[in-house]
């Protein structure tokens, strides 16, 4: 592990209580094809353990969704990935809205530091799919 | 090649016969910007030759498509990437539907083993674009 | 840097004048979370300085956009990433249209050579968002 090949791929565990927009993640071979090699989970949120530039990627699919599902609702459904702690480093890294679509997927390179905790906030009132091939979240250390 | 930097980027060759939802891929410098360095093609399907964690990515665009193209059809058009052989390891890795959209694109990290053959199944009755900047599929070994 | 870990993540600076469909990028720690480590910017366009296979990724979100924004316009809004110079290597690498959606995001592996300049052409009459979590463009060297 000293090479710095920190990497994680997570599957959705559950959504938060009503006023908590965060998605809660889980990972490990016993669960399927998810894993944590370096980063760790803190109450379902991903915590970075090594400084560096990371490729962050995510896909979220809304449950039992058709193209009209998202347009039925007054408030747009949006997914934002950000650093939520420490508070001094809080920032939104990646944001997408579901516009008459049922899936968002994206990726980006970003510097992360040891101790950064990443949150994935799903705003709106639609439940995400827990299917492991439809909703997942991962990071990959790519260089110092 | 001993570093394990296995990598491939493929372009669409053709779709299967009617009852075969698989997309058939091709790769090589003579074809354009596609290539295979480590993985290999077996009858248009990508076969892994080195164990490890891979970044799998795909983009598929539907041919001559407008925002109404997908809504014209009763059955949803869905793209699934999975391990299709060996049968004992068969699993769907990544799945997206075209909901009033013409392109899906996503990526994920997943463990793959030597001999795993990846299939990309396009269900529905819409032809995918063969333009090399619109439809492509690739894998990149990222760590053991 | 001799390892060849060239990498860049850029944020949108501005769009071009009316007849210039190119997006103009900027990067550097002073601007936020964007950076250039190896590649360089030439008048807002990304220039490669090391041969190799790169992972190219992009996300573009249209400004003040709803699902009806893109359908209001006669001409489709399309994003294309390509090599624009040298002219002898000019090619489109990745292309997506906004079909009743407000964001496109994708990635692909492609061989690039020292001196290749990448352009990101946004056709149509809609302005892209300059929010750094909504619109970004990056490359990562992955192998020789």
């Amino acid at each position: 592990e000293s090479l710095g090949w920190d990497i994680a791929e997570l599957q959705l565990n559950h959504t938060g209580p009503q006023q908590d927009p965060r998605l809660y993640w889980q990972g490990g071979p016993a669960l399927g094809r998810s894993f944590l090699r370096g980063p760790e989970l803190d109450k379902g949120q991903l915590r970075i353990r090594r400084d560096g530039i990371y490729m962050v990627h995510i896909q979220v699919t809304l449950a039992i969704c058709s193209s009209t599902s998202t347009s039925r609702h007054h408030h747009p459904t949006t997914l934002a990935v950000g650093i939520c702690s420490p508070a001094s480093r809080s920032i939104s890294l990646l944001r997408l809205s579901f516009h008459q679509g049922c899936t968002i997927a994206s990726q980006r390179l970003t510097p992360l530091a040891r101790g950064d905790t990443l949150c994935t906030n799903l705003t709106g009132t639609l439940l995400p799919s827990r299917n492991t091939d439809e909703t997942f979240f991962g990071v990959q250390w790519v260089r110092p | 090649e001993s570093l394990g930097w296995d990598i491939a980027e493929l372009q669409l060759n053709h779709t299967g016969p009617q009852q075969d939802p698989r997309l058939y891929w091709q790769g090589g410098p003579a074809l354009g910007r596609s290539f295979l360095r480590g993985p290999e093609l077996d009858k248009g399907q990508l076969r892994i030759r080195r164990d490890g964690i891979y970044m799998v990515h795909i983009q598929v665009t539907l041919a001559i498509c407008s925002s109404t193209s997908t809504s014209r059809h009763h059955h949803p058009t869905t793209l699934a990437v999975g391990i299709c052989s060996p049968a004992s390891r068969s699993i769907s890795l990544l799945r997206l539907s075209f909901h009033q959209g013409c392109t899906i694109a996503s990526q994920r990290l997943t463990p793959l083993a030597r001999g795993d053959t990846l299939c990309t199944n396009l269900t529905g009755t819409l032809l995918p674009s063969r333009n090399t900047d619109e439809t492509f599929f690739g894998v990149q070994w990222v760590r053991p | 840097e001799s390892l060849g870990w060239d990498i860049a993540e850029l944020q949108l600076n501005h769009t071009g004048p009316q007849q210039d469909p190119r997006l103009y990028w900027q990067g550097g720690p002073a601007l936020g979370r964007s950076f250039l480590r190896g590649p360089e910017l030439d008048k807002g366009q990304l220039r490669i300085r090391r041969d190799g296979i790169y992972m190219v990724h992009i996300q573009v979100t249209l400004a003040i956009c709803s699902s009806t924004s893109t359908s209001r316009h006669h001409h489709p809004t399309t994003l294309a990433v390509g090599i624009c110079s040298p002219a002898s290597r000019s090619i489109s690498l990745l292309r997506l249209s906004f079909h009743q959606g407000c964001t496109i995001a994708s990635q692909r592996l492609t061989p690039l050579a020292r001196g290749d300049t990448l352009c990101t052409n946004l056709t149509g009459t809609l302005l892209p968002s300059r929010n750094t979590d909504e619109t970004f463009f990056g490359v990562q060297w992955v192998r020789p």
Epitope: - | T125, L126, S129, R130 | -
Partner: antibody, heavy 120, light 111 residues
Framework: QVQLKQSGPGLVQPSQSLSITCTVS????????VHWVRQSPGKGLEWLGV???????DYNAPFISRLSITKDNSKSQVFFKMNSLQADDTAIYYC??????????????WGQGTSVTVSS | DIVLTQSPASLAVSLGQRATISCRAN??????????MHWYQQKPGQPPKLLIY???NLASGVPARFSGSGSGTDFTLNIHPVEGEDAATYYC?????????FGAGTKLELK
Amino acid sequence: QVQLKQSGPGLVQPSQSLSITCTVSGFSLTTYGVHWVRQSPGKGLEWLGVIWSAGITDYNAPFISRLSITKDNSKSQVFFKMNSLQADDTAIYYCARNDYYGNLYAMDYWGQGTSVTVSS
Amino acid sequence: DIVLTQSPASLAVSLGQRATISCRANKSVSASGYTFMHWYQQKPGQPPKLLIYLVSNLASGVPARFSGSGSGTDFTLNIHPVEGEDAATYYCQHSREFPLTFGAGTKLELK
């Protein structure tokens, strides 16, 4: 096997409407689209419109105002109605199945045709 | 609308010989890595029958003596060797965009 059978009148009065029913067998209207094409000595083969598996229609622009294509999936029937017929609408009218690929827009099986004369 | 011009309007070919029919579009019918040109055969008193789709692919049950070629705007249907049952009118059709349009037809007669 795949079949499309058409039924409808042979003679229509000017300014009246034409209704043709296309009853299909060997395939489902929830999977395949059905096109309508007419053929006349003066204009050759002319595409009129199509109804897709989801019930959405596309029409040839000159006919939008007076053409309606509907269907009943459970009865495997497609209904063609054209209003305000004139003498130059005299033609053979065909229904035809869209090819398996929904965006190929080729027609792989055709009805036998309905010969329509517009005359008083 | 895309206009398809067929030539010749008619031709007479001996049994066993080659028949060549041309179809020219006034703009490209290529898109998405395909060329959206198809060919039909129509015999008197019958509906058209799909022969070839996407320039060169034979429809189900069509004999191999039929072949199609071309790209962009110029297309050719070849029949070789011509058999007695091939006497018919042949139409090209594009499906690049709506409206779909057909050529005016080429009547093949046997000498």
